[in-house]
Amino acid sequence: SGTTNTVAAYNLTWKSTNFKTILEWEPKPVNQVYTVQISTKSGDWKSKCFYTTDTECDLTDEIVKDVKQTYLARVFSYPAGNVESTGSAGEPLYENSPEFTPYLETNLGQPTIQSFEQVGTKVNVTVEDERTLVRRNNTFLSLRDVFGKDLIYTLYYWKSSSSGKKTAKTNTNEFLIDVDKGENYCFSVQAVIPSRTVNRKSTDSPVECMGQEKGEFREI
């Protein structure tokens, strides 16, 4: 139902990485505009992206208030230039999104190797602790602050001269691994939340190799 010149939004999809969260939908509007509302299961609806011709709405500011809550959004369709007009039932057309729980579902962004340092036959590899848009006491929290020990990093490391990748894991942002003296190694890291069933892993970090500028070598 609804007025003849509006269509309901469809394919509502959450796109979220490191809690930066955007709701996307279709279709591209023709003679209509959209408004988005978001709410927790028990909360009130809050309107965002008023009368927009976009087919996406950044809801980060709302979901970061409590990333462990489950959110629902809905997209209202209005005739362009006549936003007071409603559907035949007296309400504007709208479509509900799937439920979204940021803590369980946000994609893990690609990690970055911040540095590595060799001391004798040990190498310390440090992963950058990425800042998120989640705030506590007016400061932005890092990924580690938000996930704590739920977040694991897997390090893949290999001799530059071979293909086999050894692995190491940490629930901090640092690895200390044994290496063969006189060999150059390459490194890549992956963020993992093992307790999840979906979106468990990030993409791999860019590969960093010894003998390049990120590293430091100290002979003991």
Partner: antibody, heavy 120, light 107 residues
């Protein structure tokens, strides 16, 4: 329900080849690491190698390096073990196992195994 | 590679007995040790992970502990279904390695 099912085992002559499959259901292999483990008759388990299907990274035991290759087809949710230049000492039951990539990564699910016999 | 030395290789016990199996790692493996139970013709089954954590669905008579590089699997009161072979495994470094196994037989 999480399940791993191996297939492709059988009798092969020394120097021959065989490809084992590990079909996964109840989870997506690209979200985990898949290991191959073998067990010779009357012996303990021996780790063969792993693959991370999300990036194709692999590592092999010295005893099989250069002869065995692990691969994965994420569209089929299946991992493979290609075994070439087989020797009598490769005779074993071959298992695939799932690694949840936790901090200490035990193998939480195993297949039922498939027997490979290398004999002339 | 890290060696996992398991002892004893076999033991005989009666239902209700307390059974202890040990594994010694050749170098530090932190708590990255698991214990598996295997019955003839079957795949190993995870019992204990991270040295002392009971895997889901495993009876509470099974427990694990760590002291440095020594790891212990204890069955507090042996049940008929516990007669099997037990293996330890480290996954601290690549390659993961297994102990040689302990066969628990009926006395």
């Amino acid at each position: 329900e999480v399940q791993l099912v191996e297939s492709g085992g059988g009798l092969v002559q020394p120097g021959g080849s065989l490809r084992l499959s590990c079909a996964a259901s109840g989870f997506t292999i690209s979200s985990y690491i898949i290991h191959w483990v073998r067990q010779a008759p009357g012996k303990g388990p021996e780790w063969v190698g792993y693959i991370d299907p999300s990036n194709g990274y692999t590592y092999y035991a010295d005893s099989v390096k250069g002869r065995f290759t692990i691969s994965a087809d994420t569209s089929k949710n299946t991992a493979y073990l290609q075994m070439n230049s087989l020797r009598a000492e490769d005779t074993a039951v071959y298992y695939c196992a799932r690694d949840p990539q936790t901090l200490t990564s035990p193998f939480d699910y195993w297949g039922q195994g498939t027997l490979v016999t290398v004999s002339s | 590679d890290i060696q996992m030395t398991q002892s004893p290789s076999s033991l005989s016990a009666s239902v209700g007995d307390r059974v202890t199996i040990t594994c010694r790692a050749s170098q530090d493996v932190n708590t990255a040790v698991a214990w598996y139970q295997q019955k003839p013709g079957k795949a190993p089954k995870l019992l204990i992970y991270s040295a002392s954590f009971l895997y889901s669905g495993v009876p509470s008579r099974f427990s694990g502990s760590r002291s440095g590089t020594d790891f212990t699997l204890t069955i507090s009161s042996l049940q008929p279904e516990d007669f099997a072979t037990y293996y330890c495994q480290q996954h601290y470094t690549t390659p993961p390695t297994f102990g040689q196994g302990t066969k628990v037989e009926i006395k």
